[in-house]
Structures are given as structure tokens and as C-alpha cells.
């Protein structure tokens, strides 16, 4: 199983739940349906996971291979600065944003984009295989 604190990465684990994709040491869920940001977050939390928190450019580039033009919600919000749901600041990439009212973050194959949080979009959850300890 996975080791470490809530915000650690996972140790190498054998497999992921049904309909989840294993990539590196994490499991990723790419939704088929669309929800607003808060509902997407709730969906992930209910499955012992979290809305996608991207740790670095390498992970972002790898994930973008699986994305299209359609935007997906990720665990990124603007609360006096863009921060991931684990509390860390967005510092390895830029987010396209020039509106005060667009405070939730999304991703597509081209990069990060701010949006109004109530827009229904696809979403991406991330978790450790068969573990509820290390969410990110």
C-alpha cells in the first residue's frame, strides 16, 4: 500500500480501482460526465481521492497527453493567489486568467485556465492505489 503523510506521493502500488488509470505511482480518474467545481471536489473526496493536484511540469505534461480541447476541473483555486487544494502555491506553470470572478482552475491539452466555478466541466481525481492515506 501507500506510505507517508496526507500530502506525500505514493509508493509503488500494484493497481487502481475500476475505471481509474494508473500512471506513475498514482491513480487518476477522468470523468465522463460534467459537474461544477464543488461537486467535482465532493465526488473525488467520496472516493478517498482529491481533485487533481499537479506537483510539477513533468506530471502536467504527462497528463495533458490524455486530455483534449475540453477543460477538466482540477484542485486549483484563487484565494488571494492561485493555490492547490493541498495548500501549495501554483509556481511551476501559468494559468490563463484575466477575470476577477473566475476563481477555479481547469486544465486541457493546452494548459491551465481559470473559469467560473459553477461551469459544468469534466474533472480529474487523483489518489494512491488502494489507499486513503496519501491523497496527493
Amino acid at each position: 500500500l501507500c506510505q507517508g503523510s496526507n500530502y506525500s506521493t505514493c509508493a509503488s502500488c500494484p493497481s487502481c480501482p475500476d475505471r481509474w488509470m494508473k500512471y506513475g505511482n498514482h491513480c487518476y480518474y477522468f470523468s465522463v460526465e460534467e459537474k461544477d467545481w464543488n461537486s467535482s471536489l465532493e465526488f473525488c473526496l467520496a472516493r478517498d481521492s482529491h481533485l487533481l493536484v499537479i506537483t510539477d511540469n513533468q506530471e502536467m505534461s504527462l497528463l495533458q497527453v490524455f486530455l483534449s480541447e475540453a477543460f477538466c476541473w482540477i484542485g486549483l483555486r484563487n484565494n488571494s493567489g492561485w493555490r492547490w487544494e493541498d495548500g501549495s502555491p501554483l509556481n511551476f506553470s501559468r494559468i490563463s486568467s484575466n477575470s476577477f470572478v473566475q476563481t477555479c482552475g481547469a486544465i486541457n491539452k493546452n494548459g491551465l485556465q481559470a473559469s467560473s466555478c459553477e461551469v459544468p466541466l469534466h474533472w480529474v481525481c487523483k489518489k494512491c492505489p488502494f489507499a486513503d492515506q496519501a491523497l496527493f
Epitope: D36, N98, Q102, S116, E118
Partner: antibody
């Protein structure tokens, strides 16, 4: 810095077609969630929404004026154009463009954060 | 179309005193997503309108905290805790929850 600027003929004769252009900078109308709307204000009267267009070319019109209005965009020029046919003296107004934000409904919008200075249109023979 | 009714239409206020503007919608303007897209705009003399409040009670960037919005359903209020000379102009409420988006007739705030 977001800037919008309206331009138009100033004076239009009754029955003629009005063409208004909104030229903007500081953002792209290809960006997800961005839109531009047109709002008018007759002298001494309230504001009235006319039409808007989204980044994905979805459009919506004031139902009472729909048959007379056409909105389009030219993203390469950063412009949105509104045409209004069969102009009448009651269409005399200041016409504004404003940036609008998408919240999941293409037919309406919220948060007109940025407005142009407005262009005055007088309809008279 | 949803009718937005503002009152009063004219509001003389002494500088430093509070002011309150009411906006009533002809039907409930809670959107099916749970949000209420009720906004307040101020149009100063000779200027374009500018956004003050969005989604009922959220102050837009740079708007002084003497401005506050409240309400739900069909009844909404814009309050200015202490009116200043620069607050003079016409205040409009706006709803974007339902099609078509509509404005109120405006409330003209002037100094006594």
C-alpha cells in the same frame, strides 16, 4: 489591462442599417469563458441588453429585437461587430460593449467587469 | 422577461449618512445551479457603468467596503454605509440568472 472601445457612424437615417464595432485588448475572445455583449441606453433612460457572443461563437439576442440584430466576431482583429437593421428614431441611444463571463448558460451571463466608453448613435432624417 | 423594479428612483442623501436601494424581481432569480446572478452597477455622470457587486453580495475588485449587497429570491438591497461625494450617480440592479438578462430602471443618488 482590459480595454474596450466602440465605434460607429454617429448619425443614421431611418430604415438604414447600423454597424457598430467593439475593438478590445487585454484578453482574447478565443479564451474559454469569455464573451462580449452589447448594451444600449437611450438618452435619460435605463440600460437594455441587446446581444452577446461567446468565445466558441455561441450567440444570444434580445428576443424583441432578434430579427434586426446580428452579432459576429473577428478574433484576428480583436473585434466584435453588431449590425442593427431598419433603424428608427427610438433606437437613438448610447451603445456600449462590455466583456461578459460564462457560468454555464450560453443564453445569459454575469459580471460585466469591463465596459467601453460608449458610442452615441442618433437616428434622424 | 423578468422585471427588475428599483426603489426609490431618486435618493437625496447627506454625505456621511447611510443609503439603501431596493431591487425587486418579478420572479425568483435563483438559477438552477443554486447561484443568484444579481449585480449592482454604478453609472457616474458622463461615464460608463461599472460593476460594484456580483452574485448578490460579492464586492468587485477595488470597490470600497462601504458598499454591501444582500437579499435572496426576489428582494435585494444595496447599502452604502457612509455616502461620499464620489458615490453620486445612477445605480442599476441587473439579473443574469434567467433569459433574457435584464436591468432595473435605476436609482439616482444625489447629495443633499
Amino acid at each position: 489591462q482590459v480595454i474596450l472601445k466602440e465605434s460607429g457612424p454617429g448619425l443614421v437615417k431611418p430604415t438604414q442599417t447600423l454597424t457598430l464595432t467593439c475593438t478590445f485588448s487585454g484578453f482574447s475572445l478565443t479564451t474559454f469563458g469569455m464573451g462580449i455583449g452589447w448594451i444600449r441606453q437611450p438618452p435619460g433612460k435605463a440600460l437594455e441588453w441587446l446581444a452577446h457572443i461567446w468565445w466558441n461563437d455561441d450567440k444570444s439576442y434580445n428576443s424583441a429585437l432578434k430579427s434586426r440584430l446580428t452579432i459576429s466576431k473577428d478574433t484576428s482583429k480583436n473585434q466584435v461587430v453588431l449590425t442593427m437593421t431598419n433603424m428608427d428614431p427610438v433606437d437613438t441611444a448610447t451603445y456600449y460593449c462590455a466583456r461578459t463571463i460564462y457560468y454555464g448558460n450560453y443564453l445569459t451571463f454575469y459580471a460585466m467587469e469591463h465596459w467601453g466608453q460608449g458610442t452615441t448613435v442618433t437616428v434622424s432624417s | 422577461d423578468i422585471l427588475m423594479t428599483q426603489s426609490p428612483l431618486s435618493l437625496p442623501v447627506t454625505p456621511g449618512e447611510p443609503a439603501s436601494i431596493s431591487c425587486r424581481s418579478s420572479q425568483n432569480i435563483v438559477h438552477s445551479n443554486g447561484n443568484t446572478y444579481l449585480e449592482w452597477y454604478l453609472q457616474k455622470p458622463g461615464q460608463s457603468p461599472r460593476l460594484l457587486i456580483y452574485k448578490v453580495s460579492n464586492r468587485f475588485s477595488g470597490v470600497p467596503d462601504r458598499f454591501s449587497g444582500s437579499g435572496s429570491g426576489t428582494d435585494f438591497t444595496l447599502k452604502i454605509s457612509r455616502v461620499e461625494a464620489e458615490d453620486v450617480g445612477v445605480y442599476y440592479c441587473f439579473q443574469g440568472s434567467h433569459v433574457p438578462p435584464t436591468f432595473g430602471a435605476g436609482t439616482k443618488l444625489e447629495l443633499k
